[in-house]
Each structure stands twice: as C-alpha cells, then as structure tokens.
Amino acid sequence: IWELKKDVYVVELDWYPDAPGEMVVLTCDTPEEDGITWTLDQSGEVLGSGKTLTIQVKEFGDAGQYTCHKGGEALSHSLLLLHKKEDGIWSTDVLKDQKEPKNKTFLRCEAKNYSGRFTCWWLTTISTDLTFSVKSSRGSSNPQGVTCGAVTLSAERVRGDNKEYEYSVECQEDSACPAAEERLPIEVMVDAIHKLKYENYTSSFFIRDIIKPDPPKNLQLKPLKNSRQVEVSWEYPDTWSTPHSYFSLTFCIQVQGKSKREKKDRIFTDKTSATVICRKNASFSVQAQDRYYSSSWSEWASVPCS
Amino acid sequence: VPGGSSPAWAQCQQLSQKLCTLAWSAHPLVGHMDLREEGDEETTNDVPHIQCGDGCDPQGLRDNSQFCLQRIRQGLIFYEKLLGSDIFTGEPSLLPDSPVGQLHASLLGLSQLLQPEGHHWETQQIPSPSPSQPWQRLLLRFKILRSLQAFVAVAARVFAHGAATLSP
C-alpha cells in the first residue's frame, strides 16, 4: 500500500481466484482512544471498533472510503483504491490500446517542432467517474523539468457500437535546447482513476522521434504561359522551428486525379516550389518532413488544379 | 578549420546530408523498434553527443563555429571507429549491399574535410569491449545506428545553416 495523496491510498493487489488478498491496517487520525467505530462509504454498517481497523482487501468491494467516527462525528477518512495485477501484469482496462505504432501503445505523443512543446493523447470508452493526472520529466534517474497543463477532453467519436473519448495534455520542457542532440528521453506518466480503480501508464520518447510538422501553408498555383504546366509554391508552416536554414524541411508533392485509382507520381524536393502538370479536376498536394531525420510526415495540404 | 579557418560549408553540407540518407538506409526501422531499455541513461553516456553548450545552435555558430565543428569532428571519428570495429565486422556478417560500408567511408570523408592533413585535434577514446554473442552485436549495431542518425541530423543542420549564412 502507498499514499497517492493525502488520505488516498493505493492497494496493490495481485489478483487470482481465491487469492488471499492484501492485509491493510487503517489508523484513525485522532488523539482519541476509545469509542471509535469504522464504516465503509455511506453504509451505516459498523465494520469494527478501536483506533485501528485491519481489513483483508480481496476485490473492489473492499475498496472505498473508510471513515472512523466517535459519537456520530467523523474523525478521519482513508480512501482505498485498487491497483490490480493479474498474471503478473498490471491492469490496463481504463485506456484503449491504440496499436500504433505497435501493440500496447496507450499514450501517443506528437511535437510540431523542436521547441520542447509536445501533446500527448489517449483514448477511453469510459464516460464518467474518471480522473487523470500527468507528470513528465527529461530522464528518470536525474530528472529535468517538464511542465504539463490540464488534461482536457479533446474529442468524442462514435464508431458503430463504440463510443470513444479522447483526452489530451500539452507539456513543455522547462529548459529546452532545440539545436542539441537529445541524450535522455522524455518520460510521461499518466495516472488514471476510474471509481476505485487506479492504473498508471507511461511513455518514453525523444522529441526528434515524435516530430510531425504541420502541413505546408499558402499553396499557390500559377499557370505557365502556353503550357500545360503550372508552377506550384508553398511555405513552411508557421509552427515549424526557425531559422529554416537550420531547421530545414523536405517535401513530397503529388498530383491526384479525380479517381483514387489513378496513378499518382510522387516527387521529393527540398525546395518550396515545383513545376507540375496539373490537369482539370485533379488536385495538387504537398506534405513536409524534417529534412535530416525521418520522423513523421505532415498531413497533406491540398489545392484543386482548376 | 583548426586555428579558426572556415570549413568548406557547401561540401560539408552535401556530405552530411548524404550521411543522413545512409544512416537511415542502414537502419530504417525507427518507429517500430524500441531499443531503449533500463540503464540506457548510462550506456548512452559513452557516445559523444552534441549538447547545449557546444555552440551548434544558430547563435553559437555565428559567434564562433569552432567549438561546434570540433565537437562534430570528435563524433564523426568516434562513429567511424565504431563502424570499423568488430561490432560491425564480426558475426553476423553484414549483407554485401549494406550501406554501412558507404556510411563508414562518408564519416571518414567528412571528418577529413573538417581537418585537413597536418592538423590533429585530440579525439575521444572509443570503448573497446565488444559483445561476444552475435545477437548482442546485432542489438548494439541497431543502437549505434539509431544514435548516429540523431548525431548526423544535428551535424547536417549545422552545415546547412553554415552554407546558407556563413559561407564567404
């Protein structure tokens, strides 16, 4: 058992059928010695008497808010949450496995640039009685500061008979050094509490590996005189690190016909303009990636040819 | 470069960008193989990193690019020695068309561009013990290539910026 915060305790339960459970001794926080009784949650049933109460925690029915009383007055409370382990594995029932980029991915994080700012998000199908708290640091043995904001419900999605809730958090490294080569990974720890269930999730990454630029902006098409060709141009997204001579992007461009089956020619370039053949009803698209490190490509930015 | 002369920024830019391409073709599985393990905070201390105080940021390069170039050269020589060691030459053998050979040669080429004949900067000692098991060697290769990818990305940014803003 360990203290999560004042008067809130997490009981680590290695659960299997007929498991003996964990013995927990609760102590009433009072100078009083006599006439103390204990109850669980709103039930008026007296569980025991005396300054301490010993309970055997075997299941969620044994968790909850234990209160010691004297003469009808509450003296102190202890909220017991369960962190369940089955077959040697801590439970991961609260968050959905996003399975990308690999199985057992519960937290996903992205950064738009090298400023040390990043966003993490996760999915759950639980809609009520749910709280999250997030901590982050650079490195674990001698951690350097990362400050995270409040967790927000960022999206709700219905897919068939599934309803998903997406939560996200933004974090910022306190002393970011965008030009340096990262030596220690960022660690993100999320505590999830649903009713009386406690779970924790972690992710470890380098900012360089979670970079995903915003799409290029200001796509423009300029038809060339007496030619089927057009000159296309675009700009670096506003959110990308500067100066661009240092933090350079590379681009992938394509012309996509109206039919999705039509063959698309992709061209890679470091420039911010190109000459392409852009037929009527087709569209021109461009996406960006860090020029020197193969992290994620941005989403496509598109403009119709006509 | 030693003694304050400028490097051939454009040549260094081309070669460092080639290094990036080669490092990724040698080990492309970036997102699908998590090679960080417990204790990695210690093991990564062995390889030279371009750190915050090394002057490799745009402002630092404008003030005095020598500190940064020396750090880059140290790293290039370190990785060049690693790629030539039995970590890469031992079993399991690299495939004949492996880009590691080209990568090795390009590391050497760029480090020589940064130090013409006759100049000798002190270089970092390379850790000698190599793992005995082939599977350990394979894992170490992946870790070295992952680390090299990060290192050459910063070096390439430095040379691109230098070529754009510091070339005479």
């Epitope: 969620f60 029915g61 029932d93 199908t125 008979d161 599934n162 009713k195 | -």
Partner: nanobody
Framework: EVQLVESGGGVVQAGESLRLSCAAS????????MGWFRQAPGMEREFAAA????????YYADSVKGRFTISRDNAKNTVYLQMSSLKPEDTAVYYC????????????????WGQGTQVTVSS
C-alpha cells in the same frame, strides 16, 4: 447507455440444471465486466458470479462455486450463467449487471442492470 435483457429462467427440480442468458446492447458493451446477482424474497440482493471484459477471468461467490459457471460470447454480446446441481435455496430472481470494476461482489460497483429472470427450484 447499456441495455441488459435476461432470459432462461424457469421452474426446475432440485439437482437439475438451467442456463441463463443475458443479451447486452448499447455502446462499448464489450468493455464491461459482467456479473450475475440474485435476490430471494425478503432478502438483500447477493452476488453470484462475475467475468472480466476479456472473458479470461471469472469470480464466484462461495455459495455457488463448483456448481455455477459464468461465460461470455463477445461476438454475440451475451453472457451466460450455467447452473447445475440446483438447490431450493437457489430460488431467486437472477439479475445480470454490467460494470467496469472487476472483480467485485458489491452491487453498487455495477452501473447497469437487467430486469431479472425468475428461477424456482422445487424440492
């Protein structure tokens, strides 16, 4: 919202078997832990059995252990309670319940309840 509909109740002789079914519908039903409770006339509702959302783990009250088996078919969104060696004291209304805390034998840890199905065991 999750809807639960029990079926399969009836009148049987002591020693016989019965299989109850609980059909679940609504959002995310596959993510719920499922349980069976029962309530005899004039008694409090009591826990009988529960199964985890993956279906890999089960939990039973001592009074039914070895006689009742809980199972689930996630493809059909259905939970079953196979009851054998029935006794007169098993007579009760059997309720299907869905919640997100497993294992729990406490009724208020379950969020959704069915209407119940009557099981009568005569001697």
């Amino acid at each position: 919202e999750v809807q639960l509909v029990e079926s399969g109740g009836g009148v049987v002789q002591a020693g016989e078997s019965l299989r109850l079914s609980c059909a679940a519908s609504g959002y995310n039903v596959k993510d719920y832990e499922m349980g069976w409770f029962r309530q005899a006339p004039g008694m409090e509702r009591e826990f009988a059995a529960a199964i985890s959302w993956r279906g890999s783990s089960t939990y039973y009250a001592d009074s039914v252990k070895g006689r009742f088996t809980i199972s689930r078919d996630n493809a059909k969104n259905t939970v079953y309670l196979q009851m054998s060696s029935l006794k007169p004291e098993d007579t009760a209304v059997y309720y299907c319940a869905a919640g997100r805390l497993y294992p729990s034998s406490r009724s208020r840890d379950y969020d959704y309840w069915g209407q119940g199905t009557q099981v009568t065991v005569s001697s």
